[in-house]
Interface confidence: low
């Protein structure tokens, strides 16, 4: 599984993280987890192994099985949302996962991230620095 090393977005804004996986994992459960340690992070939202999107309060997840990419969106960002998160795939044995650092810029601070042309408050990251975990 691959994803961006870090993502940055403004306070009160939203961000989208895209996590890519290899062929064969299409119908597995995908999840988004918070916490510095992989083995103790807390799952915030997950798919049901289908392409049906799921939304929970300020976070949503959607799996595009054709492109083998699942997308996580966090809205209404607060400063204390800044943390280490993980994109993951549930499987028998250890899950697959990759770490994503979420940085939230305080309101009024200049943001260096590229913004989507349709919404100046949303930053989309596919990640130029990709890495594999596990």
């Amino acid at each position: 599984i691959q994803g961006p090393e870090s993502v940055r977005a403004p306070e009160q804004g939203s961000l989208t993280v895209q996590c890519h996986y290899k062929q064969g994992w299409e119908t597995y459960i995908k999840w988004w987890c918070r916490g510095v340690r992989w083995d103790t992070c807390k799952i915030l939202i997950e798919t049901r192994g289908s392409e049906q999107g799921e939304k929970s309060d300020r976070v949503s997840i959607k799996d595009n099985q054709k492109d083998r990419t699942f997308t996580v969106t966090m809205e209404g960002l607060r400063r204390d949302d800044a943390d280490v998160y993980w994109c993951g795939i549930e499987r028998r044995g250890p899950d697959l996962g990759t770490q994503v650092k979420v940085i939230v810029d305080p309101e009024g601070a200049a943001s260096t991230t590229a913004s989507s042309p349709t919404n100046s408050n949303m930053a989309v990251f596919i990640g130029s620095h990709k890495r594999n975990h596990y």
Epitope: R34, T40, C41, L44, D57, R58, V59, D80
Partner: antibody, heavy 126, light 107 residues
């Protein structure tokens, strides 16, 4: 003191809906998420879902998806749980319970239930 | 969904006994495990959260341990007011499932 006070017992016919209220006092209503848990007679506890009183955002157990609606009214510090298409298996005591972790500390991060309502008995019978 | 299995489902003990209740999760839940006590006709009461953190006002004779899939609630010296049903609950993954309960009865 911190407390959750629920509405009174209800008797409903199969197919009907029931709406249970849970009024919070003694703390900042919008700071803590509220869970709903039910317990059928002589049975264990079953988690139904959670509502964020600040945003109104919800997350339901798949089992109740499509039948349950959890809402809140910040002006009265009250959360509501409405269950539709009632059947006899829905006969239970329904509890609201406050999450132990203030929501401004974490993002979508629910822990456990430290303050409980007294429970509302819902009986479904023809 | 994550299945939570408690054992035993019931036990008989005397005042002063050391009582241990175990809870097993169908998959790893890290340390996101809570314990509740419920008496007949009453709402549950939180005893321990995050595996081992004692909720405010709960006597120190209650303790919790474990991680991953296996957890334990221990009552070091059973008191008359401890006769009740105990439930474990995981808060790792929605839906936040409970164990089936362990009833602690007087021997």
């Amino acid at each position: 003191q911190v407390q959750l006070v629920q509405s009174g017992a209800e008797v409903k016919k199969p197919g009907a809906s029931v709406k249970v209220s849970c009024k919070a006092s003694g703390y900042t209503f919008t700071t803590y998420a509220v869970h709903w848990v039910r317990q059928a007679p002589g049975q264990g506890l079953e988690w139904m879902g959670i509502v964020n009183p600040n945003s109104g955002g919800t997350n339901y157990a798949q089992k109740f998806q499509g039948r349950v609606t959890m809402t809140r009214d910040t002006s009265t510090s009250t959360v509501y749980m409405e269950l539709s298409s009632l059947r006899s298996e829905d006969t239970a005591v329904y509890y609201c319970a406050r999450d132990i972790v203030p929501m401004n500390n974490f993002y979508n991060y629910y822990y456990g239930m430290d303050v409980w309502g007294q429970g509302t008995t819902v009986t479904v019978s023809s | 969904d994550i299945q939570m299995t408690q054992s035993p489902s019931s036990l008989s003990a005397s005042v002063g006994d050391r009582v241990t209740i175990t809870c097993r999760a169908s998959q790893s839940i890290s340390s996101y495990l809570n314990w509740y006590q419920q008496k007949p006709g009453k709402a549950p009461k939180l005893l321990i959260y995050a595996t081992s953190t004692l909720q405010s006002g709960v006597p120190s004779r209650f303790s919790g341990s474990g991680s991953g899939t296996d957890f334990t609630l221990t009552i070091s010296s059973l008191q008359p007011e401890d006769f009740a049903t105990y439930y474990c609950q995981q808060s790792y993954r929605i839906p936040y499932t409970f164990g089936q309960g362990t009833k602690v009865e007087i021997k």
